[in-house]
Each structure stands twice: as C-alpha cells, then as structure tokens.
C-alpha cells in the first residue's frame, strides 16, 4: 500500500535569463528512493538522481540544469519556452513509483514574483 | 564483487536470542535496501520483511513482529537479524537479500548471502 | 495483501524437454514480478526480473512472459543442473510475497 504524499513548490514563477528550484519532498513513507526522475512537459528527461551512480544530467540540458539542493533541480538563464509543467517520479521500493507537479511560469517582466510555496498537488 | 556474506550456523534452546549478520561488500551499502528471508526445512521461502539502509527504519511482515528485529551498522556495511525468545518453529535458514534495480520496474533480489541456519532444540 | 499461486507444484521431466511453469497474482502487479532457481542447501539464484528481462550470466534457455496476473518461466531445453525448485515473487508493493515453489524432478 502506497501510503507516502509527494510536495512539491507547487505554481512558481520566475524571470527570464534568471533560474529556479524545482522541489519535490516524499513523506509520510518508510519507502527507501533509490532513484529520482525528472521530466519536462513534453515527457522529456532533464536529469536522473540514481541512489548508487548519482547524477546524470542529460546533454540537451547540461548548460542551464545543475543537481540539487537534495533530490531536487536547479534551472538557470530560464528563457519563455521553460514555462510549463515539470515532473518528478521517486522510484521507491517496496511502495512504487510517486509523482509530483510543479507548473513554471517565466516571465518577461523585470520584477517577476518568485513564489514558491509547498503544497500537495 | 558484489556478494553479501552472513554469519555461521547456530544452534540454540528455546527461549534463547540469536543475531544473524549480513555483511556487504563490492557496493554503496546505502544506496539498496535489504532485506531478509526465512526458508523453514523443507518449505519455500518467506519475505520476512526489510530495512531502508538510508534511514535504519524496519519494515516487518506480520508474522515477523516482536520477536524479530532488523538493525545495520553502516560503518561496516552490515545488517544484522535477531530474534528473541526462540522457539522450536523458528528452526530455519535465514537468507539476506538485496532489492537491485533502481527504478520500481526492475526490483528484484539480486544478490542473497549464503544462509545461516538457526537450529533451535533443546 | 498479493498472492501468488504457482503450478504445477511438482513437475517430471527429462533432459531436453521444454517446460513451462507458471504463477498467477491474486491482483494486476503489472510486471513486477521476478523468478529464482534454488538448489538445495543453497541461497536462491535471480534468473528474471520485470517479468521477462533476464539477469546478467543466466543461460539463455530461460525466458519469461507475462503481465498483469499471469505469468510463465519457459526453460527451452532443460539440462541436467535445472532439476531444482523455481520460486516467482512480486515486487509490486508491499509486502513482496514468493509463489509456493515449483520442483523440477526427473521423469
């Protein structure tokens, strides 16, 4: 029975050429994460945090994506096509796979809001 | 190479305790859970339950509370079996077992210690 | 909790005879699902995971198929060394039971 919640930073936003974090906490679950995805909105892989090998970010996003803080991913010199959702799926034994949402939206504006609140989606 | 050696044979009398180790090694101990499995003789085997390597917390199977604890050392990238208050019933082979695969798709136990078997008589 | 029954129980067979041996879930587990040979007196060996993938170092005469609830081991040519026991498992949440084993004699 999969009994753990994901939270995640939820709605955020950001502005242009600056970056963000993107978070995803699991609680709630004695599950041990050996491996953490996460994908862009069109289901494609910006990086893999494995338990055993670490790191791997993919080459496409090796310039604007660096690992962490923890399991999660920084994004920098954001540019308008990053607004959209992003995934992150912890790969948990016994209990399964879990995932959480973060919808980004980047704005042109020169005094964008960064709002970055957990909540269960 | 990977392989996970675990302690000898033991025999004990009813009502004793016994610690059963499991020692790892060619692998990043935390980074794979272990678990532990009981083969009575002559039956099939029974997923007592495991242990997150990463935070220390036991996961038992119901049959397997009370009397059975999981614990780890992490300096000697060990796991260790105890169970108290043996009785007769508890006469098995105890394997250790790590879930390999990263992703939820790909589990499995792929590498098991030897077994060590608790003989308990008095 | 999930169950899994395998059949047969006891299955008699000769060197060169193809076998199959199959496990049923109580529920869908997807392809969670793992096979392991046992000689006696020994640890089990991992021969397939995620259903039919088949781990490093394992004869190609074994294959395995399956999803949902059922699934089969398929030995194409026993020898000799396969007349053991062959257990499947789940790893579809907790708790990850064994089937009740699957004896291969010699007929």
């Known amino acids: 029975m999969m009994t753990g919640t994901i939270e995640t930073t939820g709605n955020i936003s950001a502005k242009k050429g600056g970056s963000v974090i993107l978070q995803c906490h699991l609680s709630s679950t004695m599950a041990q994460v050996t491996q953490v995805n996460w994908e862009q909105h069109d289901h494609s892989l910006l990086a893999i945090r494995n338990a055993e090998l670490g790191w791997h970010i993919y080459p496409a996003f090796k310039d604007r994506v660096a690992p962490g803080p923890g399991l999660g991913l920084t994004l920098q010199s954001l540019t308008m096509n990053d607004t959209g959702e992003y995934f992150c799926t912890y790969h948990t034994y016994p209990d399964g796979t879990y995932r959480g949402r973060i919808f980004l939206e980047v704005l042109e504006s020169s005094v964008a809001e960064h709002s970055a609140r957990f909540q269960i989606p | 190479q990977v392989q996970l050696v675990q302690s000898g044979s033991d025999l004990k009398k009813p009502g004793a305790s016994v610690r059963v180790s499991c020692k790892a090694s060619g692998y990043t101990f935390t980074s794979y859970p272990m678990n532990w499995v009981r083969q009575a003789p002559g039956h099939g085997l029974e997923w007592m339950g495991w242990?997150?390597?990463?935070?220390?917390?036991?996961t038992y199977v119901q049959g397997f509370t009370g009397r059975f604890v999981f614990s780890l050392d992490t300096s000697v990238n060990t796991a260790y079996l105890q169970i108290s208050s043996l009785k007769a019933e508890d006469t098995a082979v105890y394997f250790c077992a790590r879930t390999g695969g990263h992703t939820y798709d790909s589990y499995a136990f792929d590498v098991w210690g030897q077994g060590t078997m608790v003989t308990v008589s008095s | 909790d999930i169950q899994l029954t395998q059949s047969p129980t006891f299955l008699s067979a000769s060197v060169g005879d193809r076998v199959t041996i199959t496990c049923r879930a109580s529920?869908?587990?997807?392809?969670?699902l793992a096979w392991y040979q046992q000689n006696p007196g020994k640890a089990p060996k991992l021969l397939i995971y995620?259903?039919?993938t088949l781990q490093s170092g394992v004869p190609s005469r074994f294959s395995g198929s399956g999803s949902g609830t059922e699934f089969t081991l398929t030995i194409s040519s026993l020898q000799p060394e396969d007349f053991v026991t062959y257990y499947c498992q789940h790893l579809h949440g907790y708790p990850c039971n064994f089937g009740q084993g699957t004896k291969v004699e010699i007929k």
């Open positions: 529920q869908v587990i997807s392809s969670s």
């Open positions: 242990i997150n390597t990463n935070t220390g917390n036991p």
């Open positions: 995620a259903a039919s």
